[in-house]
């Protein structure tokens, strides 16, 4: 059959691998597109075929599996590079077929260079550690399947450029790196280098992740509204601009959605007819506590507007709070000539 179910170029799976290192790439067909796995497909007589298009070329070509030392090989549904080279960058296609069935998908593979401090264009996973929270660990990611469980690899951990040796509160423990008590000074990029033997030589796997020390749940509190507050009264004359900031502090909470909103006479600003604009700004502390400010603005306030109730609301996983702004109409000062006349007993 000439027809083939073509899933196109799967750009969602932009795979990045380091130059001069082993890489194992699973055919995405079985992971994301088909309802059966490779073993089922293989036992049903289907064959998995790989080919590629080099970077900046249009020509699809077969992958050369006859390179010295089997540099590129296929094992079940995995394409292996031992190791990668920079010019392996391109779009790779895996096609599953027999005489009556065909399905294929392409995906981009980018071979990335790293500098001597492990900096690279690679997108880094971020691991958040709670500040002063007791022992916490990070684990060297994405090394499964590279060597059999019977092989014990050697793991070296680095912070930035530096080998982690005799650090006060950071201890390498094989695949794990333990932080005895995480501090702001522990923020940074951590790299594990996994060295393992295979086919008469050694290989290195380099994995870098970013550690960000964040606020501890032990210290987390419900949202705190700093403004509006009882000390500030927004006193305006009709025709003036009314500006009321709502400033809310949120403790860092993992996966919490922080929300701030205004109500005017109990309704969302979108649901009322007055001309209100709301501008939001967000800032973060070093431990990712968040301060959100929403400024409610009415360009030309009316006396009716000055009688309304303006309430700032805030919500996080820790709770919900609200605070009303004190808004009032400015009482015009008595005119000087009238007062003077009254003072002299004029009628």
């Amino acid at each position: 059959s000439e027809r083939c179910d073509d899933w196109g170029l799967d750009t969602m799976r932009q795979i990045q691998v380091f130059e001069d290192e082993p890489a194992r790439i699973k055919c995405p067909l079985f992971e994301h597109f088909l309802k059966f796995n490779y073993s089922t497909a293989h036992s049903a007589g289907l064959t998995l075929i790989w080919y590629w298009t080099r970077q900046d070329r249009d020509l699809e070509e077969p992958i050369n599996f006859r390179l010295p030392e089997n540099r590129i090989s296929k094992e079940k549904d995995v394409l292996w590079f031992r190791p990668t080279l920079l010019n392996d960058t391109g779009n790779y296609t895996c096609m599953l077929r027999n005489t009556t069935y065909c399905s294929k998908v392409a995906f981009p593979l980018e071979v990335v260079q790293k500098d001597s401090c492990f900096n690279s264009p690679m997108k880094l996973p971020v691991h958040k550690l709670y500040i002063e929270y007791g022992i916490q660990r990070i684990t060297c990611p994405n090394v499964d399947g590279y060597f059999p469980s019977s092989v014990k690899p050697t793991i070296t951990w680095y912070m930035g450029c530096y080998k982690i040796q005799n650090f006060n509160n950071v201890i390498p423990e094989g695949m794990n790196l333990s932080f005895l008590i995480a501090l702001i000074s522990n923020n940074g990029n951590y790299t594990c280098v996994v060295t393992y033997p295979e086919n008469g030589r050694t290989f290195h796997l380099t994995r870098t992740l970013t550690v960000k020390v964040v606020g501890s749940p032990k210290n987390a509190v419900p949202p705190v509204i700093h403004s509006p507050n009882d000390h500030v009264v927004y006193e305006k004359e009709p025709g003036e601009e009314l500006l009321i900031p709502c400033t809310v502090y949120f403790s860092f909470l993992m996966d919490s959605r922080n929300e701030v909103w205004w109500t005017i006479d109990g309704k969302k600003p979108d649901d009322i007819t007055i001309d209100v604009t709301i501008n939001e700004s967000i800032s973060h502390s070093r431990t990712e506590d968040e301060t959100r400010t929403q400024i409610l603005s009415i360009k030309k306030v009316t006396s009716e507007d000055l009688k309304r109730s303006y309430v700032c609301h805030a919500r996080s996983a820790k709770g919900e709070v609200a605070k009303a702004a004190k808004v009032k109409q400015k009482v015009p000062a008595p005119r000087y000539t009238v007062e003077l006349a009254c003072g002299f007993g004029a009628t």
Partner: antibody, heavy 112, light 111 residues
Framework: SVEESGGRLVTPGTPLTLTCTVS????????MSWVRQAPGEGLEWIGT??????VYYATWAKGRFTISKTSSTTVDLEITSPTTEDTATYFC?????????WGPGTLVTVSS | AYDMTQTPASVEAAVGGTVTIKCQAS??????LSWYQQKPGQPPKQLIY???TLASGVSSRFKGSGSGTDYTLTISGVQSDDAATYYC?????????????FGGGTEVVVK
């Protein structure tokens, strides 16, 4: 720290075992390497024993040397059949990617 | 395979001057390169690892650079105490096809 021992004067063909003793280094977490230096010559890598237990030897060292982990604190280097060309200071060092720290070395003299 | 060629074999330097030592690998070693200093009767001392990272307690007058196959050790503001032999070492690959992971060494003589 790292310290080598066992170096002495031997006659050609007499097997000799050198021992590298470590303290403050967990041999289950670190690879160990042996390097030698003939008088007035450069550094010559002999081989490395990995935490996996796998040993790799330099092309010229295969069959002439045996590296083994003998305890939780010791790694041995056996010179199976020394020749006069094996006269050198033998160093043990922690690591396989880079070497640090090094022991002070132990001198082996092969002479008839 | 992965032979390390170090140049020059010997270099003279004046106190306060600069010395440059080069190391070339026969194939890319992906920045897995270290530099060592050795004085007579002593074991080698690590100066630099991962091509450019200064080992603990080493003077910042020592600078490592390079990538791929070509690497350089620069000693600036040379002092008489820098008189020693310097070696490069590749850590990218260990295999039984390798003759030596070290370069041949460079003797630095300080005048």
């Amino acid at each position: 720290s790292v310290e080598e021992s066992g170096g002495r004067l031997v006659t050609p063909g007499t097997p000799l075992t050198l021992t590298c003793t470590v303290s403050g280094i967990d041999l289950s977490s670190y690879d160990m390497s042996w390097v030698r230096q003939a008088p007035g010559e450069g550094l010559e890598w002999i081989g490395t024993i990995y935490v996996s237990g796998r040993v790799y030897y330099a092309t010229w060292a295969k069959g002439r040397f045996t590296i083994s982990k003998t305890s939780s604190t010791t790694v041995d280097l056996e010179i199976t059949s020394p020749t006069t060309e094996d006269t050198a200071t033998y160093f043990c060092a922690r690591g396989s990617i880079d070497y640090d720290p090094w022991g002070p070395g132990t001198l082996v003299t092969v002479s008839s | 395979a992965y032979d390390m060629t170090q140049t020059p074999a010997s270099v003279e330097a004046a106190v306060g001057g600069t010395v440059t030592i080069k190391c070339q690998a026969s194939q890319s070693i992906s920045s897995w390169l270290s530099w060592y200093q050795q004085k007579p009767g002593q074991p080698p001392k690590q100066l630099i690892y991962r091509a450019s990272t200064l080992a603990s307690g080493v003077s910042s007058r020592f600078k490592g650079s390079g990538s791929g196959t070509d690497y350089t050790l620069t000693i600036s503001g040379v002092q008489s105490d820098d008189a020693a032999t310097y070696y490069c070492q590749q850590g990218y690959i260990t295999s039984s096809n390798i003759k030596n992971v070290f370069g041949g060494g460079t003797e630095v003589v300080v005048k």
